[in-house]
Amino acid sequence: MPLLLLLPLLWAGALAMDPNFWLQVQESVTVQEGLCVLVPCTFFHPIPYYDKNSPVHGYWFREGAIISRDSPVATNKLDQEVQEETQGRFRLLGDPSRNNCSLSIVDARRRDNGSYFFRMERGSTKYSYKSPQLSVHVTDLTHRPKILIPGTLEPGHSKNLTCSVSWACEQGTPPIFSWLSAAPTSLGPRTTHSSVLIITPRPQDHGTNLTCQVKFAGAGVTTERTIQLNVTYVPQNPTTGIFPGDGSGKQETRAGVVHGAIGGAGVTALLALCLCLIFFIVKTHRRKAARTAVGRNDTHPTTGSASPKHQKKSKLHGPTETSSCSGAAPTVEMDEELHYASLNFHGMNPSKDTSTEYSEVRTQ
């Protein structure tokens, strides 16, 4: 799990105007919005005898800064004011007294784009290294969370689904996880980079989406992944099958992945018919769906109660009326745009209350 996105070092050991003062830093670094990067940096300066015992202060400034007016974006000088928009996100991680000017950027934002220069001060020795400068490029966040489904999803049986963002860095602001599901859910434990959703699927959750949304509040950027729950009927040796979808939302049965102890095509056809009948009943009995929002320390808390017991009613579309049979796969990671997870029935009949509960669970 990469804690810091370290790019290949494009070392630029260019000499500054005064050959006694030099600095080595990569000239360009790229970081995705919301993520972080550590930029290694080394500098050298002559030390006159009268400044030997003076503390070394280092500063990173935006290009074009006027030293006597502009605040730096980062510094190790405790009483020095820094730029408001970089406070807590830009850190002079290196120790200037050891000639280290390494810069750490967390929760990268679009407006961090630009060039930066380093300045050192040691007593009366002061120098701004105008060359080389560090050019920071902040790009779109392309990483997306992974959803992990362990084993088989069975109606009435609780399972822990994990949404993880292993590519995020430890130093950044912990992301806010939001789960969106039509199935009955509750919140499990979470770590800095993962959230667990306890799901208890029902027969009518066939075809519904389950979304894990991750917001990096430090940068105000959001990424998500959606999987689709696909109900299947396997009377014995129940298993779960996961099919990567093409993002179109259409479901399909793929040849070569249909497994199960079903003797003969006729039985299969009969079961498929039964399944269609079940979902016809589900559709006709569907009532108003309930949407529950559970917020915990969210920057944008949802309205309504913080308990799933008190649900806010809202009209939502129920599950789609399509079916497919699927086969085996134990623990699976979701990595495509849209996926199909199967729910296996053990000859169960749908309960009389077949309304869809559509809940969103937010975690932070």
Epitope: F61, R62, E63, G64, A65, I66, I67, S68, R69, D70, S71, Q83, S124, K126, S128
Partner: antibody, heavy 122, light 112 residues
Framework: QVQLVQSGAEVKKPGASVKVSCKAS????????ISWVRQAPGQGLEWMGW????????KYAQKFQGRVTMTRDTSTSTVYMELSSLRSEDTAVYYC???????????????WGKGTTVTVSS | DIVMTQSPLSLPVTPGEPASISCRSS???????????LDWYLQKPGQSPQLLIY???DRASGVPDRFSGSGSGTDFTLKISRVEAEDVGVYYC?????????FGQGTRLEIK
């Protein structure tokens, strides 16, 4: 010859906001700083804040913190000063002034705009 | 904040005579580079202020040589060797060493 051209006079009601512009004609001002200084009728000069049009860095006087916002548009060589929650005491002439620097050496506010009169009255 | 104090606040002068304005700062305006970050400005009636002196003693371009600045640390003086009618207005000293930038109260020079 560098000139700072300011927007026209404004009359505002208490509680409203005003946004004054200051456009540099001639050489671009991106290697300088722009200070905003106001002068109430019959009073002295009062510094409100400063913006570096190149870095975008700003510094505001404590008195105006939270009420003043200074921004810049480098494509048009224009800086803006917005003052919110106006009160009658904000009635003044607002000047933008170019602060000239060479490296770390300060050369004073060598170019001033003609001023924008802002009247706050109900 | 650095407090700037000017004296006198009013200065009536006969044309051709010298004039002197004093400015005192609450803390030293001497920068680590050896220069004093003190300016003098003149605001003529109905006009914007104009820079006369920067870095304590350097004359701005276009400023007549009858204007001179002196002093260091906390005590500064603006001298006009021979006052002319066009010199009337309010003179301000200003420290540019640190923000917030602060001005003196102003000295009104008028012709007797």
């Amino acid at each position: 010859q560098v000139q700072l051209v300011q927007s026209g006079a404004e009359v505002k009601k208490p509680g409203a906001s005003v946004k004054v512009s200051c456009k540099a004609s001639g050489n671009t001002f991106t290697s300088y700083g722009i200070s905003w200084v106001r002068q109430a009728p019959g009073q002295g000069l009062e510094w409100m804040g400063w913006i570096n049009p190149n870095s975008g860095g700003t510094k505001y006087a404590q008195k105006f913190q939270g009420r003043v916002t200074m921004t810049r548009d480098t494509s048009t060589s224009t800086v803006y000063m917005e003052l919110s929650s106006l009160r009658s005491e904000d009635t003044a002439v607002y000047y933008c002034a170019r602060e000239s620097w060479f490296g770390e050496l300060y050369y004073g506010m060598d170019v001033w705009g003609k001023g924008t009169t802002v009247t706050v009255s109900s | 904040d650095i407090v700037m104090t000017q004296s006198p606040l009013s200065l009536p002068v006969t044309p051709g005579e010298p004039a002197s304005i004093s400015c005192r700062s609450s803390q030293s305006l001497l920068h680590s580079n050896g220069y004093n970050y003190l300016d003098w400005y003149l605001q003529k009636p109905g006009q914007s202020p104009q820079l006369l002196i920067y870095l304590g003693s350097d004359r701005a371009s276009g400023v007549p040589d009858r204007f001179s600045g002196s002093g260091s640390g906390t005590d500064f003086t603006l001298k006009i060797s021979r006052v002319e009618a066009e010199d009337v207005g309010v003179y301000y000293c200003m420290q540019g060493l640190q923000t917030p930038i602060t001005f003196g109260q102003g000295t009104r020079l008028e012709i007797k």
